[in-house]
């Protein structure tokens, strides 16, 4: 079953390579377990950036080596991606699955274009 997912169209990463955005889904029921996946689309290639499964009201748990962190509040997921560089500029798509209880729902956002600008190196001081 399909579900609507909303996310901002554009986000500019900070000078430290951190980008945050909210992924909001229109839950048709009372889900207790949710899976969130962030995918990056660039040059028609899609790669998985990170994924987390969480129980409603609890922290999102990403893998130890994940570049993502996040918190949830109701039907909103606040996602933060760190360690970004200019080459990571691309469309970051939020995918939400309501895993439990049945029925299963899947929603895919239109994507957030994240722009990353590498900071200029500081000039050497004499």
């Amino acid at each position: 079953k399909a579900m609507h997912v909303a996310q901002p169209a554009v986000v500019l990463a900070s000078s430290r390579g951190i980008a945050s955005f909210v992924c909001e889904y229109a839950s048709p029921g009372k889900a207790t377990e949710v899976r969130v996946t962030v995918l990056r689309q660039a040059d028609s290639q899609v790669t998985e950036v990170c994924a987390a499964t969480y129980m409603m009201g609890n922290e999102l748990t990403f893998l130890d080596d994940s570049i993502c962190t996040g918190t949830s509040s109701g039907n909103q997921v606040n996602l933060t991606i760190q360690g970004l560089r200019a080459m990571d500029t691309g469309l970051y798509i939020c995918k939400v699955e309501l895993m439990y209880p049945p029925p299963y729902y899947l929603g895919i956002g239109n994507g957030t274009q994240i722009y990353v600008i590498d900071p200029e190196p500081c000039p050497d001081s004499d």
């Epitope: 399909a2 996946t37 995918l39 689309q41 899609v46 790669t47 998985e48 994924a51 798509i93 995918k95 899947l106 895919i108």
Partner: nanobody, 119 residues
Framework: EVQLVESGGGLVQPGGSLRLSCAAS????????MGWFRQAPGKGQEFVSD????????YYADSVKGRFTISRDNAKNTLYLQMNSLRPEDTAVYYC????????????WGQGTLVTVSS
């Protein structure tokens, strides 16, 4: 056109085991993910398990964790679901599904195979 064909369903006693297979044909097997869903009579579609090829990560519904194991054999273009310690509440039609890119949703579905757990 990709086709998914499930097999391995049948009647089994509580506590018994079954292994479901899902053979993919007609296209590439390099899916982003493949999974198993089930639907019991009069109930909504339930996620059972899936495997994401990029990282080889597996996910399971709490109701089957520790009892079911998902795996795939790329050489045979086949996805498996090993089901142990079966319970009457596992009775359902089990469907195999495949996802091409991760942002397209579950693109392909099998026709389903019936699993009945009863004494």
């Amino acid at each position: 056109e990709v086709q998914l064909v499930e097999s391995g369903g049948g009647l089994v006693q509580p506590g018994g085991s079954l292994r479901l297979s899902c053979a993919a044909s007609g296209g590439t097997f390099s899916f982003y993910g493949m999974g198993w869903f089930r639907q019991a009579p009069g109930k909504g579609q339930e996620f059972v398990s899936d495997i994401r090829t990029s990282a080889g990560r597996t996910y399971y519904a709490d109701s089957v964790k520790g009892r079911f194991t998902i795996s795939r054999d790329n050489a045979k273009n086949t996805l498996y679901l090993q089901m142990n310690s079966l319970r009457p509440e596992d009775t359902a039609v089990y469907y195999c599904a495949a996802e091409m890119s991760g942002i397209s949703g579950w693109d392909y579905w099998g026709q389903g195979t019936l699993v009945t757990v009863s004494s």
